[in-house]
């Protein structure tokens, strides 16, 4: 309803005109164009693509399109000294070596500059020792090993399967356990869906396929050498020893054919339970070391990658707002890929390209959005969200004053089953209303709305008749905007059926087999799911930039705050005796949530009734909505994580990809029964309850009548 009420909107130039201009065929064409060669961050090929996108966005009609460059720490394998892992015999002879590259997919045999599989930012080293299998290398896996099984990983090389949690958390956990090296592998239990063929005959991971990826623990810092500040021409850079988040032990990824050779010889303890077994024909013994006949053999890693300060390029396009040019709605996604980027990121970049083209078409016909829209093609996302973070650090003062919303646009698909949305509660109603107006692309839902198919296939666990919307975690470019700056953020993509497909991510994630053909043959031949994602992302941007009253509903924040308070309280109540002993009370938090609920309700009533023709009052009300997300930011940040400043949400300390609610309290309570000083530990719980209660109350007050 709100869009075509905007002052400069004629009936022709409404949301429908924007959506109708989006074409599946264009997205397909753009995806093909973006995926013919690798676009690794820091390479000439990715610089050329940045310039191409800059040129095309200008042609599409944006007001300005600039490149923003930064010199950041990246990591590459040594071209003449490849990384690999060996099994060595008692004489030190290498009797087995893992492969040096993935067999290239058909049609790509002669492509140069395919970076071999590596773990970005691994230090150099050639550790050798006994192997310990650590399952997914999650916090709970190491608890099981160390506490229950009494297995010591100190001085061992650990082998962990990919999946469940961000790989950087796995490496951090292994380091803390005293390991001297980490081997990461893709188990078919997680990366091979039953009944589907391996690429190129299907979308499953072949045995020689390997997942690349960074293994940093940046906690939102951006460039490891310039935390908090842009990596510009006059930047002061830390020494490598003081760099943020770098791993201290060598790490290397392998495929399941190579993993089979390492795991089949494992001896020592049997796996503790079936959850430690994958799908390979190996015992999944934990170790340490190899069994009987092979007990004198060891594993040796050979890692020679180098960290290098390298120039990266963001593309920033501007479509100036007609009424509120100083209010920014941002649509951003990354451009850099590990290899061809068939899904990650180019399925997202192609959608952004088509959204820009559609907005440009409207602008050429005389239309402008109410608010300014910024479009971003980020660089070096794969190396730690570096491009987006450096740009946000450089522009933080503008963003914190003018940033209305950030919509992320990485991979448009990770499956073709249903929609998946993660966003701030402020956007729930926007997403609901928008998806009710869009057609579902799903088979069996012809003529039905996207909302209907999404709700049917992915129902909310709390509210019947509504779809699941998840918390924002991290591992993508919205991180700096949401977790550091407190700008309302959201993301949407098409996903798999999580019920039937238990594998992690999509099987060919970050492998050489993530090609255009993977998408065109197996995931989305008609590009109808891409088009739907373009409509959702583009539609959200359109509404956020164009509606007279910002499409945020603060009452939805009140609902989730109560849910999160209940959840953290019940976690704490697992320790009733200690809560009594140390006088731990959640009363202040529940009181603050109650106040927030009441004030949000009153604010919503005023929002319905105020005089929208009064630009000052309109701006005032919109500012209260815009700054609500900002009000959840604690300038001091979370303990030991200064760039995670949102008090309601943060990436889980155990899995960067997952969002945690009331993270300060959650972390203070985590494993509290094992703390050496319970008094101090419970004191920190109380402090975190205080911080959370204060923040919720302070946020509530920003919604009160101003005078």
């Amino acid at each position: 309803k709100s869009s075509n009420e905007a002052t400069n909107i004629t009936p022709k130039h409404n949301m429908k005109a924007f959506l109708d201009e989006l074409k599946a065929e264009n997205i397909k064409k753009f995806l093909y164009n973006f995926t013919q060669i690798p676009h690794l961050a820091g390479t000439e090929q990715n610089f050329q693509l940045a310039k191409q996108i800059q040129s095309q966005w200008k042609e599409f009609g944006l007001d300005s399109v600039e490149l923003a460059h930064y010199d950041v720490l990246l990591s590459y394998p040594n071209k003449t000294h490849p990384n690999y892992i060996s099994i060595i015999n008692e004489d030190g002879n290498e009797i087995f070596n893992t492969s040096l590259f993935e067999p290239p997919p058909p049609g790509y045999e002669n492509v140069s500059d395919i970076v071999p599989p590596f773990s970005a930012f691994s230090p150099q080293g050639m550790p050798e020792g006994d192997l310990v299998y650590v399952n997914y290398a999650r916090t709970e896996d190491f608890f099981k090993l160390e506490r229950d099984m009494k297995i010591n990983c100190s001085g061992k090389i650990v082998i962990a399967r990919y999946g469940k949690v961000f790989r950087g958390n796995k490496v951090k956990n292994a380091q803390l356990a005293g390991a001297k090296g980490v081997i990461l592998y893709s188990d078919p239990a997680d990366y091979f869906a039953p009944g589907v063929k391996s690429y190129p005959d299907g979308w499953n991971l072949p045995g020689g396929g390997v997942q690349r990826g960074n293994i940093l623990n940046l906690n939102g810092a951006g460039d490891p050498l310039t935390p908090g500040y842009p990596a510009n021409e006059y930047a002061y850079r830390r020494g490598i020893a003081e760099a943020v988040g770098l791993p201290s032990i060598p790490v290397h990824p392998i495929g399941y054919y190579d993993a089979q050779k390492l795991l089949e010889k494992m001896g020592g303890s049997a796996p503790p339970d079936s959850s430690w077994r994958g799908s390979l024909k190996v015992p999944y013994n934990v170790g340490p070391g190899f069994t009987g006949n092979f007990s004198t053999q060891k594993v040796k890693m050979h890692i020679h990658s180098t960290n290098e300060v390298t120039r990266i390029y963001n593309v920033i396009g501007t479509l100036r707002g007609a009424v509120e040019p100083d209010r920014y709605v941002i649509l951003g996604g990354h451009r850099d890929s590990w290899v061809f980027g068939g899904i990650d990121p180019q399925s997202g970049a192609a959608v952004v390209h088509e959204i820009v083209r559609s907005f440009g078409t409207l602008k050429k016909e005389g239309w402008r959005p109410r608010r300014t829209i910024l479009f971003a093609s980020w660089d070096a996302e794969e190396f730690g969200l570096l491009g987006s973070t450096e740009w946000a650090e450089e522009n933080s003062r503008l963003l914190q004053e003018r940033g209305v919303a950030y919509i992320n646009a990485d991979s448009s698909i990770e499956g073709n089953y249903t929609l998946r949305v993660d966003c701030t509660p402020l956007m729930y109603s926007l997403v609901h209303n928008l998806t009710k107006e869009l057609k579902s692309p799903d088979e069996g839902f012809e003529g039905k709305s996207l909302y209907e198919s999404w709700t049917k296939k992915s129902p909310s666990p709390e509210f019947s008749g509504m779809p699941r919307i998840s918390k924002l975690g991290s591992g993508n470019d919205f991180e700096v905007f949401f977790q550091r700056l407190g700008i309302a953020s959201g993301r949407a993509r098409y996903t798999k059926n999580w019920e039937t497909n238990k594998f992690s991510g999509y099987p060919l994630y970050h492998s050489v087999y993530e090609t255009y053909e993977l998408v065109e043959k197996f995931y989305d031949p008609m590009f109808k799911y891409h088009l739907t994602v373009a409509q959702v992302r583009g539609g959200m941007v359109f509404e956020l930039a164009n509606s007279i009253v910002l499409p945020f509903d603060c009452r939805d924040y009140a609902v989730v705050l109560r849910k999160y308070a209940d959840k953290i309280y019940s976690i704490s109540m697992k320790h009733p005796q200690e809560m009594k002993t140390y006088s731990v009370s959640f009363d202040s938090l529940f009181s603050a949530v109650k106040n927030f609920t009441e004030i949000a309700s009153k604010f919503s009533e005023r929002l319905q009734d105020f005089d929208k023709s009064n630009p000052i009052v309109l701006r005032m009300m919109n500012d209260q909505l815009m700054f609500l997300e900002r009000a959840f930011i604690d300038p001091l940040g979370l303990p030991d994580r200064p760039f995670y400043r949102h008090v309601i949400y943060a990436p889980s300390s155990h899995n960067k990809y997952a969002g945690e609610s009331f993270p300060g309290i959650y972390d203070a309570l985590f494993d509290i029964e094992s703390k050496v000083d319970p008094s101090k530990a419970w004191g920190e719980v109380k402090r975190q309850i205080y911080v959370a209660a204060f923040t919720v109350q302070a946020a509530a007050e920003t919604l009160s009548e101003v005078a």
């Epitope: 099994i87 045995g207 050779k261 077994r277």
Partner: antibody
Framework: QVQLVQSGAEVKKPGASVKVSCKAS????????INWLRQAPGQGLEWMGG????????NYNENFKGRVTLTIDKSTSTAYMELSSLRSEDTAVYFC?????????????WGQGTLVTVSS | DIVMTQSPLSLPVTPGEPASISCRSS???????????LHWYLQKPGQSPQLLIY???NRFSGVPDRFSGSGSGTDFTLKISRVEAEDVGVYYC????????FGGGTKVEIK
């Protein structure tokens, strides 16, 4: 496509040795074990042993231990089976077969077979 | 070693009719990882064996869907829903959970 090509038929005297080759192509040789099996005239299949080209590790059927030796030449992607102290009951067709890795873990590609005749 | 026992030894069939072959192992074929590595091969006259079914019930590439496998633990069955002339040959069950062993074979011939 995956191919296993075996050497030609052999006639041997009792007490002699025979060495059969199996040249692999169409896949990464080091990823897949090679099994050797035999089939006596009108009989079923009998597994003799297997070798892993990746590390040279071998497994032998107890019935053949000491008489069979499996080797590989990575440079030519060739596997070899040598059977010594031949006797007339060793007359059989000898097959090499690739041990399919995940998800098969079955012998998914076979050589054409090599007839070895042991006769005085 | 695991002993694999197939029945019947010989199976005369009429084209278009179904056929069923049974295979029993001397001990469980369930691997510690939960998978059962029981496979079926067909050796056509004068040819090398070829893989038909792997891990009990999965058809290998190019195998017609008239072939199906089932069973668990120690008892397994291969079924041909409608026998065709080209299906003649000797069918072997085999296990690779332990040291590989084969059944004695079932000769399928047209009546």
């Amino acid at each position: 496509q995956v191919q296993l090509v075996q050497s030609g038929a052999e006639v041997k005297k009792p007490g002699a040795s025979v060495k059969v080759s199996c040249k692999a192509s169409g896949y990464t040789f080091t990823y897949f074990d090679i099994n050797w099996l035999r089939q006596a005239p009108g009989q079923g299949l009998e597994w003799m042993g297997g070798i892993s080209p990746g590390d040279g590790n071998t497994n032998y059927n107890e019935n053949f231990k000491g008489r069979v030796t499996l080797t590989i030449d990575k440079s030519t992607s060739t596997a070899y089976m040598e059977l010594s102290s031949l006797r007339s009951e060793d007359t059989a067709v000898y097959f090499c077969a690739r041990d399919g890795n995940f998800p098969y873990y079955a012998m998914d590609s076979w050589g054409q077979g090599t007839l070895v005749t042991v006769s005085s | 070693d695991i002993v694999m026992t197939q029945s019947p030894l010989s199976l005369p069939v009429t084209p278009g009719e179904p056929a069923s072959i049974s295979c029993r192992s001397s001990q469980s074929l369930v691997h510690s990882n939960g998978q059962t590595y029981l496979h079926w091969y067909l050796q056509k006259p004068g040819q090398s064996p070829q893989l038909l079914i792997y891990t009990v019930s999965n058809r290998f590439s190019g195998v017609p869907d008239r072939f199906s496998g089932s069973g668990s633990g120690t008892d397994f069955t291969l079924k041909i829903s409608r026998v065709e002339a080209e299906d003649v040959g000797v069918y072997y069950c085999s296990q690779s959970t332990h040291v590989p062993t084969f059944g004695g074979g079932t000769k399928v011939e047209i009546k």
